[in-house]
């Protein structure tokens, strides 16, 4: 047989016996000659053992590059592969020789009395017991002990090969202390040497330190570090610790095996390092290393040793946090300290408790920040041992992107009569206030949606070309007033007004407000009509349960077919910066209403009456008139707001007060409600009557008592009443000092 690949084109060495396997009897002479094309060498079984004195390799007498190997009186142990090869190459010819010795059918091991087989306890692994045979076709079984068990080749996973040995799955013999091969020849049993079975695992799955990180102590405290190694079965483990101060008096190391569940494929080992009283020199890196027969695994942790307990804020602790409404705000308490401090958060001096909107821990988290979260937050760190306290104030500023108040009134805004002067407003609330409010415009016909056009939810108007109001060519003459600042609903707002000198063309106007955190915009539909005109009788804003009439007046010579409609729910949701479809072009959303027609000399008047107006009656009312000549429809829209009935309330308290005789008392009583309540004053439950000294002003809101006298002392009541009931507040006025005697007395 030949092995290897030629490095250069040489013929294989040629053997005198042209066979792969040769079988000879013990005590005979083995002689093989090898011829080749360059220097040759022989390799034979155990060719480095003491047997080499019996082996003779000689140069052939009849030619160059020829060597003969001779072994007189061969024994079973000479069984094996004989190889003739060219020096420095892999080119070789091999013959396997069996020296049949029926008295010792197994080739004896080079080692003395016994061998060792390492096995891994694994269902998939096999082990080879190297009991080679000097006879190729023996019946060999494997004996394992104790208890005694015999394994016979099964033609599958258990087999014997004279050149290799006995192959068997590892787990079958993992219980055994020793194994040997046995052959039966003519009812006679022959045994190989004994092999000691060593079950060896080496795999370390992981090495875990506990605590794993952030270990802090102060001088004198005890350090306990646990190191756990998880391994496969049958692993022998050595632990080693590396630590800063190697010469430690109070260091203690304990290693032990941990119990694992029966049937577990894993073993656990624990090494515990204890230092009773740490010193500053014990600060540093602690490394635990676990070593097995074929693996070393390590893990490290840093131990910090402080001189004494302390607490301080870290350099990264913020003093100002800026956020935008709706964001999640995280303010971490960055500290240095040992042991970890107790952390308490306060807002404007009031302790904060965690709930679904706020989490007050190591990190103060506000889930969705709102304006009311603006303020000063104080974090107080307390060292649990020394009770030392440190505090730090963080100012939270919540920014609000511009919000335009009028945007909440989403409606196809009223139509405007041709030639009138109109004012459009944008009331902007933003923190910080907007750095600019700009107005833009565009002609309505450039932007209006034809019924044939597809309306997209996000952009129902293809309004692309917004023009600056400075450029009002082709549009209405415009003047932008200087921004005003007003306190509305307790908030500082910026009001921007746009004055249209004469409403000549229908257009769209857009105000855009920008501040550092965002922008807001409002689009106003400014529809100019020469057509009908809507008026409300008796009032612009009725209160529920009051009656109201909507009058639509149109020139009879120009218009016909006056009809009242109410605008139904929007077919599409209205998004930021969008407008509803112009109503005259989309009658599908209108509900026809019953109305009464009146005429005078020039006009037709269509009156739609709402008796006992309710909140449901709010909305947009459309009066549609048709041009007699062109048949073109003209629409006028009026938004009707019905005010909710609200029982009277009095804002602010009347304060008890003490006044000296001769001084004046001024008090006010502000009431709200719908319908507006009537205010009345009482003194000692009697109606207060105005005279020269008692003055009631501003619909009785303000009471003034001039040059008070002793008899003005008493219980004063302010009462606000409407059809929905009354509200009252009381105060006691004390008058001090002696009354001067008059001449009459």
């Amino acid at each position: 047989a030949s092995v290897g690949l030629p490095s250069v084109s040489l013929d294989l060495p040629r053997l005198s016996i042209q066979k792969d396997i040769l079988t000879i009897k013990a005590n005979t002479t083995l002689q093989i000659t090898c011829r080749g094309q360059r220097d040759l060498d022989w390799l034979w079984p155990n060719n480095q053992s003491g047997s080499e004195q019996r082996v003779e390799v000689t140069e052939c007498s009849d030619g160059l590059f020829c060597k003969t190997l001779t072994i007189p009186k061969v024994i079973g142990n000479d069984t094996g592969a004989y190889k003739c090869f060219y020096r420095e190459t892999d080119l070789a010819s091999v013959i396997y020789v069996y020296v049949q010795d029926y008295r010792s059918p197994f080739i004896a091991s080079v080692s003395d009395q016994h061998g060792v087989v390492y096995i891994t306890e694994n269902k998939n692994k096999t082990v080879v017991i190297p009991c080679l045979g000097s006879i190729s076709n023996l019946n060999v079984s494997l004996c394992a002990r104790y208890p005694e068990k015999r394994f016979v080749p099964d033609g599958n996973r258990i087999s014997w090969d004279s050149k290799k040995g006995f192959t068997i799955p590892s787990y079958m013999i993992s219980y055994a202390g020793m194994v040997f091969c046995e052959a039966k020849i003519n009812d006679e049993s022959y045994q190989s040497i004994m092999y000691i079975v060593v079950v060896v695992g080496y795999r370390i799955y992981d090495v875990v330190l506990s605590p794993s990180h952030g270990i802090e102590l102060s001088v004198g405290e005890k350090l306990v570090l646990n190191c756990t190694a998880r391994t496969e079965l049958n692993v022998g483990i050595d632990f080693n610790w590396e630590y800063p101060s190697s010469k430690h008096q109070h260091k203690k190391l304990v290693n032990r095996d941990l119990k694992t569940q029966s049937g577990s494929e894993m073993k656990k080992f624990l090494s515990t390092l204890t230092i009773d009283g740490v010193t500053r020199s014990d600060q540093g890196l602690y490394t635990c290393a676990a070593s097995s027969g074929l693996m070393t695994k390590k893990n490290s942790t840093f131990v910090r040793v402080h001189e004494k307990p302390f607490v301080a804020f870290g350099s990264g602790m913020e003093s100002l946090v800026e956020a935008t409404v709706g964001e999640r705000v995280r303010i971490p308490a960055k500290y240095l300290g040992y042991p970890p401090p107790e952390i308490k958060w306060y807002k404007n001096g009031i302790p904060l408790e965690s709930n679904h909107t706020i989490k007050a821990g190591h990190v103060l988290t506000i889930m969705e920040v709102s304006e009311r979260d603006t303020g000063n937050y104080t974090v107080i760190l307390t060292n649990p041992i020394s009770k030392e306290k440190q505090s730090h104030v963080v100012s939270l500023v919540v920014y609000v992107p511009p919000q335009i108040g009028e945007k909440s009134l989403i409606s196809p805004v009223d139509s405007y009569q041709y030639g009138t002067t109109q004012t459009l407003t944008c009331t902007v609330y933003a923190i910080p206030p907007p750095h600019h409010i700009h107005w833009y415009w565009q002609l309505e016909e450039e932007c209006a949606n034809e019924p044939s056009q597809a309306v997209s939810v996000t952009n129902p108007y293809p309004c692309e070309e917004w023009r600056s109001v400075e450029d009002f060519q082709g549009g209405n003459k415009i003047e932008v007033n200087k921004n005003q600042f007003a306190l509305i609903e307790g908030k500082n707002k910026t009001v921007s007004t746009l004055v249209i000198q004469a409403a000549n063309v229908s257009a769209l106007y857009k105000c855009e407000a920008v501040n550092k955190v965002g922008r807001g915009e409002r689009v106003i539909s400014f529809h100019v009509t020469r057509g009908p005109e809507i008026t409300l009788q008796p009032d612009m804003q009725p209160t529920e349960q009051e009656s109201v009439s909507l009058w639509c007046t149109a020139d009879r010579s120009t218009f016909e077919n006056l009809t009242w409609y109410k605008l139904g729910p929007q077919p599409l949701p209205i998004h930021v910066g969008e407008l509803p479809t112009p109503v005259c072009k989309n009658l599908d959303t209108l509900w026809k209403l019953n109305a009464t027609m009146f005429s005078n000399s020039t006009n037709d008047i269509l009156i739609m009456e709402l008796k006992n107006a309710s909140l449901q009656d709010q909305g947009d009312y459309v009066c549609l008139a048709q041009d007699r000549k062109t048949k073109k429809r003209h629409c006028v829209v009026r938004q009707l707001t019905v005010l909710e009935r609200v029982a009277p309330t009095i804002t602010g308290n009347l304060e008890n007060q003490t006044t000296s005789i001769g001084e004046s008392i001024e008090v006010s009583c502000t009431a709200s409600g719908n319908p507006p309540p009537q205010i009345m004053w009482f003194k000692d439950n009697e109606t207060l009557v105005e005279d020269s000294g008692i003055v009631l002003k501003d619909g009785n809101r303000n009471l003034t008592i001039r040059r008070v006298r002793k008899e003005d002392e008493g219980l004063y009541t302010c009462q606000a009443c409407s059809v929905l009931g009354c509200a009252k507040v009381e105060a006691f006025f004390i008058i001090e000092g002696a009354q001067e005697k008059t001449n009459l007395e």
Epitope: Y118, T120, N122, N124, K125, T126, V200, G201, Y202, G236, I237, D238, F239, N240, E242, T287, A289, S291, S292, G293, L294, M295, T296, K297, K298
Partner: antibody, heavy 117, light 107 residues
Amino acid sequence: EVQLVESGGGLVQPGGSLRLSCAASGFTFSSYGMSWVRQAPGKGLEWVATITSGGSYTYYVDSVKGRFTISRDNAKNTLYLQMNSLRAEDTAVYYCVRIGEDALDYWGQGTLVTVSS
Amino acid sequence: DIQMTQSPSSLSASVGDRVTITCRASQDIAGSLNWLQQKPGKAIKRLIYATSSLDSGVPKRFSGSRSGSDYTLTISSLQPEDFATYYCLQYGSFPPTFGQGTKVEIK
């Protein structure tokens, strides 16, 4: 830098004894298992013996068991291989090798042991 | 013991050639295989561990892969300093065993 320097090799007669040493530096010797691997002239590599970091466990190839002893002195950062009853087939270059997370990771230059009469 | 059959035992190649060396494991070693490089008079150096992970400082032209029980070392573009003998080492089962080695020579 990990360094392993073997010494103690030489010529010895069959049946004789020899003690190989391996001086380790550049790493925490006491944390690592160590091995000896040999290479007969012109042949491949063969694992000989292993010792765990603390010396608690030792393992040997079958052919040297009972004749060779692996040991270590962690205080001196030195690994040893005591070889007794030497045979001609023990002739080889003996390498000192560190056992890392994935078996044998760092090797020494080797020391030659020749067993011959 | 697990037998590692390494092939070829030697090969001749030129600088720039792509070279592959294979080791076949007689049993499953679950990817626990290293590749070593031996140059005359120098310490043996580990190139690859755990089938395919490169040791630090080893050029990226060396790579390792696995297909079943066959493990391959590939040198994508042979360099003059790569002429050496390469060994595979299995550590999937104790004891560790080596391949017979592959000598890479200059053509």
